[in-house]
């Protein structure tokens, strides 16, 4: 009986620890995509609707803020698209990029953790163009550090929640 109580207590402890594990999955807010033809910061994301969720992390001023030290897996998926019904591309040669950036408040500094993308030739003869970028990596993050996303050509972003999103989850503590 004691073993059973110990076992269930262990399960509970494991479960509560898992529930406390920080994670976030943020999806693009399509009503507030910034304009620009160069690199811009994407600051408007959903954290509590559709597929978007957040726990033990904070989303503020367009940045995902780490609340617990640890090793985290960070990921971002960005889709670019253009359909001729919205008009023509002013240039057919495009640099479609995403940058995942870490900003530290304590020691004011900013680092690009991951970048991905390509230069593309989107011919005016085609009705539809699509390009997807996925980046992911394992990083040591400290409490108070902020993660943000920058992209090129935001007017071409695919605004669907299954297309443009980023997130993080804690994998383990820092020893």
């Amino acid at each position: 009986e004691k073993a059973m109580v110990d076992g269930s207590w262990l399960d509970l402890a494991k479960r509560s620890k898992l529930e406390a594990q920080p994670f976030a999955h943020l999806t693009i807010n399509a009503t507030d995509i910034p304009s620009g033809s160069h690199k811009v910061s994407l600051s408007s994301w959903y954290h509590d609707r559709g597929w978007a969720k957040i726990s033990n992390m904070t989303f503020s001023n367009g940045k995902l803020i780490v609340n617990q030290d640890g090793f985290y897996y960070l990921y971002a998926n960005i889709c670019f698209r253009h359909h001729e019904t919205s008009g023509d591309l002013a240039t057919e040669y495009l640099q479609l990029m995403v940058y995942v950036t870490k900003t530290s408040i304590k020691i004011p500094s900013s680092h690009t953790l991951m970048k991905g993308g390509s230069t593309k030739y989107w011919s005016g003869n085609s009705e539809f163009h699509f390009y997807s970028i996925n980046v992911g990596g394992f990083f040591k993050l400290r409490s108070g550090e902020e993660i943000s996303i920058e992209v090129s050509n935001p007017s071409l972003l695919d605004p669907d929640q299954d297309a443009t999103y980023f997130g993080a989850f804690k994998v383990r503590d820092i020893d």
Partner: antibody, heavy 126, light 103 residues
Framework: QVQLVQSGAEVRKPGASVKVSCKAS????????IHWVRQAPGQRLEWMGW????????KFSQKFQGRITVTRDTAASTAYMELRSLRSEDTAVYYC???????????????????WGQGTLVTVSS | EIVMTQSPSSLSASVGDRVTITCRAS??????LNWYQLKPGKAPRLLIY???SLQSGVPSRFSGSGSGAEFTLTISSLQPEDIATYYC?????FGQGTKVEIK
């Protein structure tokens, strides 16, 4: 205020060429595209082509491909449309129009014509 | 290639009347539709863009609605200065025009 001022009326013989100018003022010429649209007597408006005033990129209607040239002089904030091998059915009022999309804000030419020139009548007659 | 079809091709109405012009696209164009006013000897004027957004400086009696393939331009109370030909447009394609006259 934004203004597009076009050159005056022209009369040409069949087979000749015509070049119409469109001088822009009141905005940063290089940040927008200029479209050319025409209207023949009793006909609907007809899109001919555009030029991105910033980089000089152009796109034309299939109907005019090979006969039309659109250029721009950024120093003079002026766009030009030349139509060659004129025929009587090219008799029309030719308009330049500014695209609403600012190239600093994005890279899509949206085909919202927010400002128009006053039109240039081109008559092709033998 | 998308074809835009307007109806009616002409109409006659009294001052103060509500006037409706319809525009159909040969396939879905979402909300990428604009309306223009043309008066003889004058530069064309953008009235409505993106199906329902009123261009600045345009009187509020003009309104646009619709999405997909069917759109309407409404003049809530026709004024003498509204005598003109009205065109719908999606990117490179224009409708054939609707001539509005006063009875």
């Amino acid at each position: 205020q934004v203004q597009l001022v076009q050159s005056g009326a022209e009369v040409r013989k069949p087979g000749a060429s015509v070049k119409v100018s469109c001088k822009a003022s009141g905005y940063d010429f290089s940040n927008y595209a200029i479209h050319w649209v025409r209207q023949a007597p009793g006909q609907r408006l007809e899109w001919m082509g555009w030029i991105n005033a910033g980089n000089g990129n152009t796109k034309f209607s299939q109907k005019f491909q090979g006969r039309i040239t659109v250029t721009r002089d950024t120093a003079a904030s002026t766009a030009y449309m030349e139509l060659r091998s004129l025929r009587s059915e090219d008799t029309a009022v030719y308009y330049c129009a500014r695209d609403w999309s600012n190239m600093v804000r994005g890279i899509i030419i949206a085909y919202y014509f927010d400002y128009w020139g006053q039109g240039t009548l081109v008559t092709v007659s033998s | 290639e998308i074809v835009m079809t307007q109806s009616p091709s002409s109409l006659s109405a009294s001052v103060g009347d509500r006037v409706t012009i319809t525009c159909r696209a040969s396939q879905s164009i979402s909300r990428y539709l604009n309306w223009y006013q043309l008066k003889p000897g004058k530069a064309p004027r953008l009235l409505i863009y993106g199906a329902s957004s009123l261009q600045s400086g345009v009187p509020s009696r003009f309104s646009g609605s619709g999405s997909g393939a069917e759109f309407t331009l409404t003049i809530s109370s026709l004024q003498p200065e509204d005598i003109a030909t009205y065109y719908c447009q999606h990117t490179r394609a224009f409708g054939q025009g609707t001539k509005v006259e006063i009875k």
